[in-house]
């Protein structure tokens, strides 16, 4: 015997209370595939949130985040104050680097300066709190006719594409 | 249709482990869902212990009774969900269930029909 | 930590009467609250979403209101099959280290 729901399409659901016809989603609600009994709840892109996808009765809706924030988590789930480069987010708010580490980005912590010397390498470029240091040849390498090294150019700022 | 189906509980001793399996059908775990976690003591209300998110990432987010000693994870070749948990206590004594939410904000429209775990001696 | 005060913790209704259930959250959850049904022995059901949002499949008879903290769940004729526990639930992710996701403590609705 074949389940009469199995004819429900998608965007609609079995409904058990009017003897297994197949009734739309209610507002706010999808259904992704046929021959449901319920349907799923619609995402809601509310406060930081912004919608990138409206829910439609087959689909959910997806979220990102407004500007001056990023996403974080999963699908979106939570989004987080964008610093500058050389800050990071605190408890507090934005807070400067350290002496020491650096942050290139608008999000994430700052992380400490490459120490040159464990590779051998001498400090080419001086770090700052929004770049790492740049480490040049060992020093050995700098005896008089070596080939100058050009640093390279700064990073572009990544971009904060929806996640 | 969708389901959610619990297994493995039973009896443990305090101080025992367990595991508990959810299967999920008619659904994959690589749609953007949400699968929590959800307790009932014998003649209580619920508390809610755990979630994963089975898309790509499989965030994890624990209630502060469960952190430390519960762990929420995920096979997606099976399609089950797993809760695994160590250091029972008496009052760890629950009906488990699992359910689904597809809003971010921990509203399950579809739950499993419950495993019951008992941490006697 | 969210916390859900529900009121009253029992409620004594006849058949046809109009039942209100309330729910109060510690702090402003907008409008992210569910109302579920549970009968003994049985996993709950979902009847409203984001406070006044009718879930697929449940009678009209059902209805949800409020936002920030003060949340209602009306039964507007209460029906035999609606003797039953109510839970609220409100909820969001916020971080991995501080999560709020929270159940009242439910209202049994019996037979006066």
């Known amino acids: 015997l074949q389940d009469p729901c199995s004819n429900c399409p998608a965007g609609t659901f079995c409904d058990n209370n009017r003897n297994q016809i197949c009734s739309p989603c209610p507002p706010n609600s999808f259904s992704s595939a046929g021959g449901q009994r319920t349907c799923d709840i619609c995402r809601q892109c509310k406060g930081v949130f912004r919608t990138r996808k409206e829910c439609s009765s087959t689909s959910n809706a997806e979220c990102d985040c407004t500007p001056g924030f990023h996403c974080l988590g999963a699908g979106c789930s939570m989004c987080e104050q964008d610093c500058k480069q050389g800050q990071e987010l605190t408890k507090k708010g934005c807070k400067d680097c350290c002496f020491g580490t650096f942050n290139d980005q608008k999000r994430g912590i700052c992380r400490p300066w490459t120490n040159c010397s464990l590779d051998g390498k001498s400090v080419l470029v001086n770090g700052t709190k929004e770049r790492d240091v740049v480490c040049g040849p060992s020093p050995a390498d700098l005896s008089p006719g070596a080939s100058s090294v050009t640093p390279p150019a700064p990073a572009r700022e990544p971009g904060h594409s929806p996640q | 249709s969708q389901s959610l189906v619990e297994s493995g509980g039973g009896l443990v001793q305090p101080g025992g482990s367990l595991r508990l399996s959810c299967a999920a059908s008619g659904f994959s775990f690589s749609s953007n869902y949400w699968i929590c976690w959800v307790r009932q003591a014998p003649g209580k209300g619920l508390e809610w212990i755990a979630c994963i998110y089975v898309g790509s990432s499989g965030d994890t987010y624990y209630a502060s009774s469960a952190k430390g000693r519960f762990t929420i994870s995920r096979d997606n070749s099976k399609n089950t969900l797993y809760l695994q948990m160590n250091s029972l206590r008496a009052e760890d004594t629950a009906v488990y269930y699992c359910?689904?939410?597809?809003?971010?904000?921990?509203?399950?429209?579809?739950w499993g029909q419950g495993t019951l775990v008992t941490v006697s001696s | 930590a969210l916390v859900m005060t529900q009121s009253p913790s029992t409620l004594s209704a006849s058949v046809g009467d109009r039942v209100t259930i309330n729910c109060q959250a510690s702090e402003d959850i907008d409008t992210y609250l569910a109302w579920y049904q549970q009968k003994p022995g049985k996993a709950p059901k979902l009847l409203i979403f984001?406070?006044?949002d009718l879930a697929s499949g449940v009678p009209s008879r059902f209805s949800g209101s409020g936002s920030g903290t003060e949340f209602t769940l009306t039964i507007s004729s209460l029906q035999p099959d609606d003797f039953a526990t109510y839970y609220c639930?409100?909820?969001?992710?916020?971080?991995?280290?501080?999560?709020?996701?929270?159940f009242g403590g439910g209202t049994k609705v019996e037979i006066k």
């Open positions: 639930q409100g909820g969001y992710y916020t971080s991995s280290a501080d999560t709020r996701g929270a």
């Open positions: 359910a689904r939410d597809s809003s971010s904000y921990y509203m399950f429209n579809l």
């Open positions: 984001y406070a006044s």
